[in-house]
Interface confidence: low
């Protein structure tokens, strides 16, 4: 599923991401834009053999199990396939664990490079939340 901007903002808000660990909703929508272009089925292979999955590009070396990443920790205790669902529950729940891990949203390279320090509220402007 490819979400619309406001559609995703509403879904993320419903799942409790607004101001989760101090990160406003705009940060999460911005991260999703530059990680996956709002596509729940986005996948990208990394040079270390791991793969990033889903709307928030969650990595298989640390956070989920795809059965194909040597040394996977699966800290979210989920199959990576769950992160590709049009239902973003699994991605959101795992993202909450990631953002609580010490580095906050710096765990997402795209957020660090494209969203951090910018007007992230622009990503939810005009949305009926």
């Amino acid at each position: 599923k490819v979400f619309g901007r406001c559609e995703l903002a509403a879904a993320m808000k419903r799942h409790g991401l607004d101001n989760y660990r101090g990160y406003s909703l705009g940060n999460w929508v911005c991260a999703a834009k530059f990680e996956s272009n709002f596509n729940t089925q986005a996948t990208n292979r990394n040079t270390d053999g791991s793969t990033d999955y889903g709307i928030l590009q969650i990595n298989s070396r640390w956070w989920c199990n795809d059965g194909r990443t040597p040394g996977s920790r699966n800290l979210c205790n989920i199959p990576c396939s769950a992160l590709l669902s049009s239902d973003i529950t699994a991605s959101v729940n795992c993202a909450k664990k990631i953002v609580s891990d010490g580095n906050g949203m710096n765990a997402w390279v795209a957020w660090r490079n494209r969203c951090k320090g910018t007007d992230v509220q622009a990503w939810i402007r005009g949305c009926r939340l």
């Epitope: 596509n39 089925q41 986005a42 996948t43 990208n44 292979r45 053999g49 795809d66 059965g67 194909r68 990443t69 040597p70 040394g71 396939s81 769950a82 590709l84 669902s85």
Partner: antibody
């Protein structure tokens, strides 16, 4: 239960192209990698590459880049592999398998014969 | 690419014998090693995943061991239905590679 059904045997002329299909049933097709494997007598099993049907992401063994092209149709739960510029070296049995690092489910194989 | 070398190429045994098949990797692959059985004119069948985990429906006489670069598939008291080819496969890195196979035949 999980099943992978491949298309039937093909006899092709050198230089032609062929498209092999693999229809999946019994699981969520879009979220598991489909692998393609070549088997020739005396050459064992060779991994050609893989596709994740839901996203269309593909990864190829360097040896088969330019030879094999993967596609998938999630509406029919079918993966495809096209082999181009066929030569006698492409004569083999081709398998699709569901990829989980290991290959727990395999198609029955498609025999390709390339002959003038 | 990681090379997997299987030995012996052929193993001739009598039903009831116990056998060991070897798979050696050209570099360490941790526990990312899987075993398949293939009978003539059939597709490969997964026997063992991640060195020692049995696939569902596989008889308990099949077991796997090893780590790093040296791995073994053991068959305790071979039955007639066990004859065929055995392949190992690594999933430690891309491209995925298979061993050349060991043919288990009746003596």
């Amino acid at each position: 239960q999980v099943q992978l059904q491949e298309s039937g045997a093909e006899v092709m002329k050198p230089g032609a192209s062929v498209k092999i299909s693999c229809k999946a049933t019994g699981y969520t097709f879009s979220t598991y990698w489909i692998e393609w494997v070549k088997q020739r007598p005396g050459h064992g099993l060779e991994w050609i590459g893989e596709i994740l049907p839901g996203s269309g992401s593909t990864y190829y063994n360097e040896k088969f880049k330019g030879k094999a092209t993967f596609t998938a149709d999630t509406s029919s739960n079918t993966a495809y592999m096209q082999l181009s510029s066929l030569t006698s070296e492409d004569s083999a049995v081709y398998y699709c398998a569901r990829g989980d690092g290991y290959y727990g489910y395999w198609g029955q194989g498609t025999t390709l014969t390339v002959s003038s | 690419d990681i090379e997997l070398t299987q030995s012996p190429a052929t193993l001739s045994v009598t039903p009831g014998d116990s056998v060991s098949l070897s798979c050696r990797a050209s570099q360490s692959i941790s526990n990312n090693l899987h075993w398949y059985q293939q009978k003539s004119h059939e597709s490969p069948r997964l026997l063992i995943k991640y060195v020692s985990q049995s696939s569902s429906g596989i008889p308990s006489r099949f077991s796997g061991s090893g780590s790093g670069t040296d791995f073994t598939l053991s068959i305790n008291s071979v039955e007639t239905e066990d004859f065929g080819m055995y392949f190992c496969q690594q999933s430690n890195s891309w491209p995925r590679t298979f061993g050349g196979g060991t043919k288990l035949e009746i003596k």
